[in-house]
């Protein structure tokens, strides 16, 4: 009972929910649910029955493998999906798939909070702005990543002449996509004309 698998997919894609093992032989009934008690489809040795749900018209069951195909998934489809099999012996078996649907991240905008020339050193504060997303940030100076401790939405650092970079890139990513935004400076410490 309760084999739980996690799946992360990009919104708008087509998804196959299936289990890694083969189905019990000659099972009597097979049901897919999303959340507790909301049935999507049931197969009962004669036919598949698709129930009224937000998935109607977007799902297809393969009774052979038990796979459930969902087209054009959206963030609202985030849920734990349950496949329940009723065996010929009367026993039941369940598998659970936790589906996370994420939107592709938007292209970030780099905002220059502060640039200041300080005795040949350059104080830099850049922020990487994207609308309310839970994402990972990676900053690069001329394609070289900054240290891990500087990896958040704001890059604040003091650069010495030997490690000046001309361009600074913020890469935002989630588990399904990533996008970059770049800003370039004129040495030693002024914003380049775009």
């Amino acid at each position: 009972q309760g084999h739980l698998v996690h799946m992360t997919v990009v919104s708008g894609s087509n998804v196959t929910l299936n289990i890694s093992e083969s189905l019990p032989e000659n099972y009597k009934q097979l049901t897919w649910f999303y959340t507790f008690d909301q049935k999507i489809v049931e197969w009962d040795s004669r036919k598949s029955k698709y129930f009224e749900s937000k998935f109607k018209g977007r799902v297809r069951l393969d009774p052979q493998s038990g796979a459930l195909y969902i087209s054009k998934v959206q963030k609202e489809d985030n849920s734990t999906y349950i496949m329940r099999v009723l065996k010929k012996t009367g026993n039941e078996q369940e598998w659970k798939i936790k589906l996370q649907v994420l939107d592709p991240v938007p292209k970030p905008v780099i905002k220059i909070e502060k640039i200041e020339d300080m005795d040949d050193n350059c104080y830099l504060k850049l922020s990487c702005v994207i609308p309310g997303e839970s994402v990972n940030y990676t900053w690069y100076g001329d394609k070289r990543p900054f240290p891990k401790e500087l990896q958040n939405s704001v890059l604040e650092t003091t650069l010495m002449p030997h490690n000046y970079s001309r361009c600074y890139t913020c890469q935002v990513s989630n588990s399904v996509s990533s996008k970059n935004g770049t800003v370039c400076l004129s040495p030693p410490c002024t914003l380049a004309r775009s």
């Epitope: 049935k39 049931e42 029955k49």
Partner: antibody, heavy 121, light 107 residues
């Protein structure tokens, strides 16, 4: 949460009919069957029959065949059990219960609170 | 029809006791068996289906075992709220049939 709420108590005369309702909520109604079970005063449980909320398929106990009809109304997520030609030995508490599958599995996972039907002249 | 026979018909026990109720089917039913609990004046509630699967929300002190024709329901440590009548029910074939019930009383 899953709920099955039955109609109120009925007193009927012998020969009359009774129709008991079972209004459900909290789940995909058409995805399950509804089973009816009765219990005469001080007695055990007796399976009466089953109806699929998906397509209206039914199976009735042989002893009630011809006197009982089980139906569903998907628009209101309600199941009905009608018993005709009532006799005094039909006096019982009548329960609806949800079958875990749309084709009967015989596993009833939620029960209604019961409807007392009294048949008396 | 498949006959279901429970034993004992009634049993007296104390809080904390371990209690076992047996159910015998007149023919093999694999694991197609459920156990229901009924308190006076209340509707039955399912405890176990498929002979040994605990229904959601049912305390783990209840357990079921068996297959074929012999089945048992065990309550590992009786609680005050467990005093009730217990019914086994076969789900193998129409008509589904119940045992006659086992009344569990306070000693």
């Amino acid at each position: 949460q899953v709920q099955l709420v039955q109609s109120g108590a009925e007193v009927k005369k012998p020969g009359a009919s009774v129709k008991v309702s079972c209004k459900t909520s909290g789940y995909t109604f058409a995805g399950y069957g509804i089973t009816w079970v009765r219990q005469a005063p001080g007695r055990g449980l007796e399976w009466m029959g089953w109806v699929s909320a998906y397509n209206g398929d039914t199976d009735y106990a042989q002893s009630l065949q011809g006197r009982v009809t089980m139906t569903t109304d998907t628009s209101t997520s309600t199941a009905y059990m009608e018993l005709r030609s009532l006799r005094s030995d039909d006096t019982a508490m009548y329960y609806c219960a949800r079958d875990r599958y749309s084709s009967s599995s015989g596993y009833f996972d939620y029960w209604g609170q019961g409807t007392l039907v009294t048949v008396s002249s | 029809d498949i006959q279901m026979t429970q034993s004992p018909s009634s049993v007296s026990a104390s809080v904390g006791d371990r209690v076992t109720i047996t159910c015998r089917a007149s023919q093999g039913i694999s694991s197609w068996l459920a156990w229901h609990q009924q308190k006076p004046g209340k509707a039955p509630k399912v405890l176990i289906y498929a002979a040994s699967s605990l229904h959601s929300g049912v305390p783990s002190r209840f357990s079921g075992s068996g297959s074929g024709t012999e089945f048992t329901l065990t309550i590992s440590s009786l609680q005050p709220e467990d005093f009730a009548t217990y019914y086994c029910q076969q789900a193998n074939t129409f008509p589904y049939t119940f045992g006659q019930g086992t009344k569990l009383e306070i000693k």
